[in-house]
Every structure is written in C-alpha cells, then in structure tokens.
C-alpha cells in the first residue's frame, strides 16, 4: 500500500514537472510574441503619428517637447536669442540637447528652410575647429565630410574663424565670439501608442 501510494506520488510529481516545463515554454513563447507585438505596435504608432504630425505640423503624439520641431529621428528648436558659440553650446546643454548637427542632405535642407531669414540672421551649428587650421569636427567628435557642404571662410571676421554658422542655406566659418542665434537638437523619444487614442465621440468628424 505504502509503495503504491509512493508510486502514484512519483507519477503526480513527474506530471507536474512536465506540466511546469510546458507552461514555462508557453510563457517563454508568449513573452517572445509579446516583444514582437510591442515592436510592431511601436512601429505602427510611429508611422501613424508621423502621418498625423505631417498633416498639421504638430500633434500630441509627437515625441518632441511642445514647440520643438520633429524631423527625422530628432527634435529641433531654432531660438531667436543671439549668443556666442560657447554660450549656445551651454544653452543647448541646459535644454538637455546639443547644437545642430547636419548629417545628411535632408538635414541641411531642413536647417536651411528653418533658419532662412530676410534679415540675414545666422545660426550657430555644432561644427568647429578645436585647433585653428586643423580638421573640422562636430561637437560629438565626428569628422565633417566636405561632400555635404562647402564652408566659406569669412574673411571679414577679425579673429580666428573656428566656428561654423548657417546663413540662408550657406555655411560660413566665423569668429566663435560673434553673436548668432542658437539651434538645439535632441534625439526624439518613442511615440507613445496611447497618445494616438481617439475618443469615440470624435470618430467620423472629418479626417
């Protein structure tokens, strides 16, 4: 009798262990599925948010702080206050961002459109020559590629011309102490899928 009970007990434990193993595998499979679904949801949310943002130039789903412009993977703010290059650097840092970095042609087109001014205001970029006459570097240390734009050496600047400003789509090296407007950029956050929630009562009201 004791042996039989013990045997039944063994069977039950084995079955439980097997069930536990199966459940554990199911759980792992569900976790993988969950990660995939979350990724898909994120992708769809970003695509939809981008469309909504493109239509209006603003939307609550935007991953950028209010008043900051969403372009590509970044958020940008073009400020009207004029500062030295270094003051712009610290100002951007205080805004949890860095100075404008132009990585590709579309970024240059965007920056030119945003900074264009009939009053010839120019904007500092994050490009500088840490050592006069040496290589141009972005603030994060990456080298500048001359394929992207031509830097005009501004001979009117009295001192060293080691900082770079954008003026109406043209790029000039300037004295870093000159006062120019600041452009700050920061990486865009993740689009929150819940920020796309449309209250039922608004459905059917236009697009």
């Amino acid at each position: 009798q004791y042996y039989q009970l013990s045997n039944t007990g063994q069977d039950t434990i084995s079955q439980m262990e097997e069930r536990l193993g199966n459940t554990s595998q199911e759980l792992q499979s569900l976790q993988v599925q969950n990660i995939k679904l979350a990724g898909s949801l994120q992708h769809v949310a970003e695509k939809l948010c981008r469309e909504l943002y493109n239509k209006a130039g603003a939307h609550r789903c935007s991953p950028c702080t209010e008043q900051w412009k969403w372009h590509g993977d970044n958020c940008y703010q073009f400020y009207k206050d004029s500062k030295s290059w270094e003051d712009c650097k610290y100002f951007c840092l205080s805004e949890n961002s860095t100075m404008l970095k132009i990585n590709k042609q579309e970024d240059l087109e965007f920056a030119a459109s945003q900074s264009y001014s009939e009053f010839f205001y120019s904007y500092w970029t994050g490009l500088l020559r840490p050592d006069s006459g040496k290589a141009w570097l972005w603030m994060d240390g990456t080298p500048f590629t001359s394929e992207l734009f031509h830097i005009i050496i501004d001979v009117t600047s009295p001192r060293s011309r080691d900082c770079v400003a954008i003026l109406n789509g043209m790029i000039f090296s300037k004295d870093c102490k000159e006062l120019k407007r600041c452009v700050c950029e920061r990486r865009a956050g993740m689009v929150k899928p819940e920020s796309l929630h449309v209250p039922p009562e608004t459905l059917g009201e236009g697009d």
Epitope: Y53, N54, G57, K69, W70, H71, Q105, E106, E109, F110, A112, S113, Q114, Y116, E118, E147, L148, F149, H150, I152, N168, G169, M170
Partner: antibody, heavy 117, light 107 residues
Framework: QIQLVQSGSELKKPGASVKVSCKAS????????MNWVRQAPGQGLEWMGW????????TYADDFKGRFVFSLDTSVSTAYLQISSLKAEDTATYFC??????????WGQGTTVTVSS | DIQMTQSPSSLSASVGDRVTITCRAS??????LAWYQQKPGKSPKFLIY???TLASGVPSRFSGSGSGTDFTLTISSLQPEDFATYYC?????????FGQGTKLEIK
C-alpha cells in the same frame, strides 16, 4: 513617399486671374519652404521666389513683384500661386519645388497656364 | 544678380560617349552649384548640389566638379536615357538663377 501634386492646366483670357495649387504629402509641410519656378514654352527655368511655410512670409524675385502672390493653407499642406491681370507672356508651365531657396530635390509635375484671347 | 552661362547650348553625342557640359558664374559662388536634368514635358530632376555631391539614386556615371566661377557636369558613358536638357543653378543666396540649358541630342 514625398510628393508635390499640382492642379491641372488652365486656359485663361488676358486680364483674368489664375490660382495654381501645389499639395504636399509624405513630409511635414512646415519643415520645408516652397519655391515657384516658371518655364515659358521652349525656354529655360526662372526662379520666381519662395514662401516660408512656418511664417507664411513670401519673397519674390524682382521680375515677379506685383501681379504674383504666393500663399499657403497649412491645414491641407498646400501652397498656392495666384497671378492676376494675366498677359500673353505669362503663358508658361509653373512648377512648385520644395526647400529653402537653394537646390530643389522635389518638384511638382508642373501646371501649364495658357493666356489667349 | 549672379548670371549663369552654360556652354554649349546644344550638343550631339552617341551612346557610350563621354560628355562634358560647362557652366560659368558671373562672380564666385564657391561650390554652391546644382545641376538638373529635364526631359520634354517633365519636371526637372535633381542631379547634383554643392558642385560635386550626387543626389541619391543618381547613377555614378554623372559627376560634377569646379568651384568659384567655373563648373562642369560630366557623363562618363552616355546611356539612351541621358538624352535631355541639363541646367546648372547657383544656390549662393537669392535670387537663384539658372543657366539657359544645354540640350543633349542623339547623334
């Protein structure tokens, strides 16, 4: 994908007005300016000016000051070119092109305006 | 205003030929020059900016060079689809101006 779709061809009488539209899609309209370029039949390209899509402020090339007006409706991502007191010499294809006044990566398909009595 | 002058105004060539179009600015525009290709009844197609930087999707047989006032567009080996009109345009401030165009025809 990025597209600029312009309104269809127009046939107008001298003295009339015309309004050409350019609807943008596939990007944030207010992130890039919009330019207008004219091409008379068998002729080259002429930059007419541009409009800042953030501020709505237009800038006109000297030859296009007066009868030419650039405007926007940002709610529908559309730029407009209006020409008043049409003359025979306004007969041309008008293109919209995206960007600040620099180089133009994206162009509309063009709108032909014919002015004839 | 900056004047842009292209030469020649027309050019006949055969498939496989190497072709060069020149563009001259009335004053220095540094490297602020763009090139476009236009086919009849179509809008211009952006080829090059910054005198030498190829737009994405443009075949590598196209190349640009020059700075200051003298610029060239070279097609290293003409393809049937390259027969079109080519325009240069400065982007060194406003007003923007275009060259009068170079029509590239089949010989």
């Amino acid at each position: 994908q990025i597209q600029l779709v312009q309104s269809g061809s127009e046939l107008k009488k001298p003295g009339a007005s015309v309004k050409v539209s350019c609807k943008a899609s596939g990007y944030t309209f207010t992130n890039f300016g919009m330019n207008w370029v004219r091409q008379a039949p068998g002729q080259g390209l002429e930059w007419m000016g541009w409009i800042n899509t953030n501020t709505g402020e237009p800038t006109y090339a000297d030859d296009f000051k007066g009868r030419f007006v650039f405007s926007l409706d940002t709610s529908v991502s559309t730029a407009y070119l209006q020409i008043s007191s049409l003359k025979a010499e306004d007969t041309a294809t008008y293109f919209c092109a995206r960007g600040a006044p620099a180089w133009f990566t994206y162009w509309g398909q063009g709108t032909t305006v014919t002015v004839s009595s | 205003d900056i004047q842009m002058t292209q030469s020649p105004s027309s050019l006949s060539a055969s498939v496989g030929d190497r072709v060069t179009i020149t563009c001259r600015a009335s004053e220095s525009i540094y490297s602020y020059l763009a090139w476009y290709q236009q086919k009849p009844g179509k809008s211009p197609k952006f080829l090059i900016y910054n005198a030498k930087t190829l737009a994405s999707g443009v075949p590598s047989r196209f190349s640009g060079s020059g700075s200051g006032t003298d610029f060239t567009l070279t097609i290293s080996s003409l393809q049937p689809e390259d027969f079109a009109t080519y325009y240069c345009q400065h982007h060194f401030g406003t007003p923007l101006t275009f060259g009068q165009g170079t029509k590239l025809e089949i010989k």
